[in-house]
């Protein structure tokens, strides 16, 4: 048998090429360059290689470049990029986001796998905020980006970011990520006039404390039942009757459907029944008549 | 002389896992290919998928998921682990090695182990 | 998916006789094929590699031929230790497919 770890005669690669599909896995190793495969990598995502041919491919890249790969090479690797494991990743130093766009493309359509997740993590890092053209690729590419965050990491994120921010992209996140965001947004559209304003705010007052929203009921904002539904309770519970009525507008009659439900049921158990009962929603589960309320929490505070 | 023993083989239930492993000598896995064929009674070959010399695995399409290729060059053995098996996963289990000493499944197996028989049954 | 179509599945012949098998590939594999010679209870024998060159000690009435999609495996004149089951294997592409190898060809004693 031929020793088969010497690249053939007159089969040295002068350029990366369609030739090349029909080399052996063998001779592709012994026969390309990797200096002329990283300089040529642009090259590869047009030839058909088997998935195979692909790994040998990145065996001579790993060999060539054992501390991790220089940008030139990654923003050109396509869909060599979807062979690199976390550990790959983890040694490289993304700084531009053409570089990061590039490799989100060739993972366009499925989930985040643990392989982009690295990727963001090592560009993020390197920048050392969530600037805001850095959020509108992530959450272009990933709506849920900004949600898979803990609140600490979004604590990075710049109030001029959060223009970049759409509804969806809020979808997933808990009541502690948008407590973190709501201040920024608030910060972010503070100059805006009243209705311009709520609609940019919708989505984050999910971390609205209760004095916002007392400043929000006096604005005839009419908020949805969906989104008084998704505020922290702790917020909720100090409104008024008065002030929810104002704060829902013509959608107060949602209540009903909610009752059961939080931030409603609590809010109800909170409420006087005679306050509830001029609301004409039947809702039942207030303070009955005569009964007197102490606020233990003003009590202890006092003392 | 290239020498391939599989063992691990036997009676296993519906839904059990199993482990073959395959002793190689002669050659070293660091620089071939080694594979894993099966074959059912009376049936055709059916290719389950290979291991290259740097570690990279290939499966056939039925195999990803439930079976599993593995090496440790230290201890010149080739592994397959089979997990929620089924009855139609009984059959005479070859490993093979790759021809080529290029390292990849470039020209074929050769040689072959003699098989270990595995049933699937309650 | 690259897929691998033998024909006939069995034939029968006569020591002396040459026969021939055919062997298909659904996409172009170049010249990526191996030829196998199996006997019952043995593992299978590697005759062929690159559609035409012979594995060490297989004898020279094994010949193979073609590329692209379309093989042939020649036994110019048959013997008596050649009555045995063959199969095609391609080697181009060995990742996510269903199976690298034909189903066989059977040949018996006439």
């Known amino acids: 048998e031929v020793e088969k770890t010497a690249c053939p005669s007159g089969k040295k690669a002068r350029e990366i090429d369609e030739s090349l599909i029909f080399y052996k896995k063998w001779e592709l190793e012994a026969c390309v360059d990797a200096a002329l495969l990283a300089t040529q990598m642009d090259r590869v995502n047009a030839i058909p290689f088997t998935y195979e041919q692909l790994d040998v491919l990145k065996h001579k890249l790993d060999e060539l470049y054992p501390q991790g790969y220089p940008e030139s090479v990654i923003q050109h690797l396509g869909y060599l990029f979807l062979k690199m494991s976390p550990e790959d990743i983890r040694k490289w130093n993304v700084t531009s986001l053409e570089t990061l766009k590039a490799l989100l493309e060739v993972n366009k359509g499925h989930e985040m796998s643990p392989q982009v997740a690295t990727l963001i993590d090592r560009f993020v890092k390197g920048r050392g905020q969530l600037d805001k053209d850095t959020l509108d690729t992530l959450t272009a590419f990933y709506p849920g980006y900004l949600c898979s965050l803990s609140p600490e990491e979004l604590s990075s994120v710049p109030p001029s970011s959060i223009w970049a921010v759409r509804p969806q992209d809020l979808d997933t996140c808990d009541p502690r990520q948008l407590d973190v965001l709501y201040p920024k947004a608030r910060l972010a559209f503070q100059n805006m006039n009243g209705s311009e304003y709520f609609v940019k705010i919708q989505s984050f007052l999910g971390g609205a404390p209760t004095e916002d929203l007392k400043a929000l009921s006096q604005q005839n904002v009419s908020m949805d039942l969906a989104t008084f539904m998704k505020l922290r309770t702790d917020a909720v519970l100090p409104l008024t009757v008065a002030e929810v009525q104002k704060l829902l507008g013509p959608h107060v009659e949602g209540l009903k459907a909610e009752e059961r439900h939080r931030p409603v049921r609590d809010w109800i158990l909170r409420q006087r029944q005679d306050d509830l009962d001029t609301l004409g929603l039947g809702l039942q589960g207030g303070i009955p008549n005569g009964y007197l309320v102490l606020d233990l929490s003003m009590q202890e505070a006092l003392s | 002389q290239s020498q391939l023993v599989e063992s691990g083989g036997g009676r296993v239930q519906p839904g059990g896992s199993l482990r073959l492993s395959c002793a190689v000598s002669?050659?070293?896995?660091?620089?071939?290919?080694m594979g894993w064929v099966r074959q059912a009674p009376g049936k055709c070959l059916e290719y389950i998928g290979y291991?290259?010399?740097?570690?990279?695995?290939y499966y056939a399409s039925w195999a990803k998921g439930r079976f599993t290729i593995s090496k440790d060059n230290s201890k010149n053995t080739v592994y397959l682990q089979m997990n929620s098996l089924r009855a139609e996963d009984t059959a005479t289990y070859f490993c093979?090695?790759?021809?080529?000493?290029?390292?990849?499944?470039?020209?074929?197996?050769?040689?072959w182990g003699q098989g270990t028989q595995v049933t699937v049954s309650s | 998916a690259l897929q691998m179509t033998q024909s006939p599945s069995s034939l029968s012949a006569r020591v002396g006789d040459r026969v021939t098998i055919k062997c298909q590939a659904s996409?172009?594999?170049?010249?990526?094929l191996a030829w196998y010679q199996q006997k019952p209870g043995k593992p299978p024998k590697f005759l062929i590699y690159?559609?035409?060159d012979l594995a060490s000690g297989v004898p020279s009435r094994f010949s193979g031929s073609g590329s692209g999609r379309d093989f042939t495996l020649t036994i110019s004149s048959l013997q008596p230790e050649d009555f045995a089951t063959y199969y095609c294997?391609?080697?181009?592409?060995?990742?996510?497919?269903?199976?690298?190898f034909g189903c066989g060809t059977k040949v018996t004693v006439l």
């Open positions: 093979a090695r790759g021809s080529s000493s290029g390292g990849y499944l470039d020209d074929g197996f050769d040689p």
């Open positions: 690159d559609a035409s």
């Open positions: 294997q391609q080697v181009y592409d060995s990742n996510n497919v269903e199976n690298v």
């Open positions: 291991i290259s010399k740097i570690g990279t695995t």
């Open positions: 002669g050659f070293s896995l660091s620089s071939y290919a």
């Open positions: 996409q172009s594999i170049s010249n990526y």
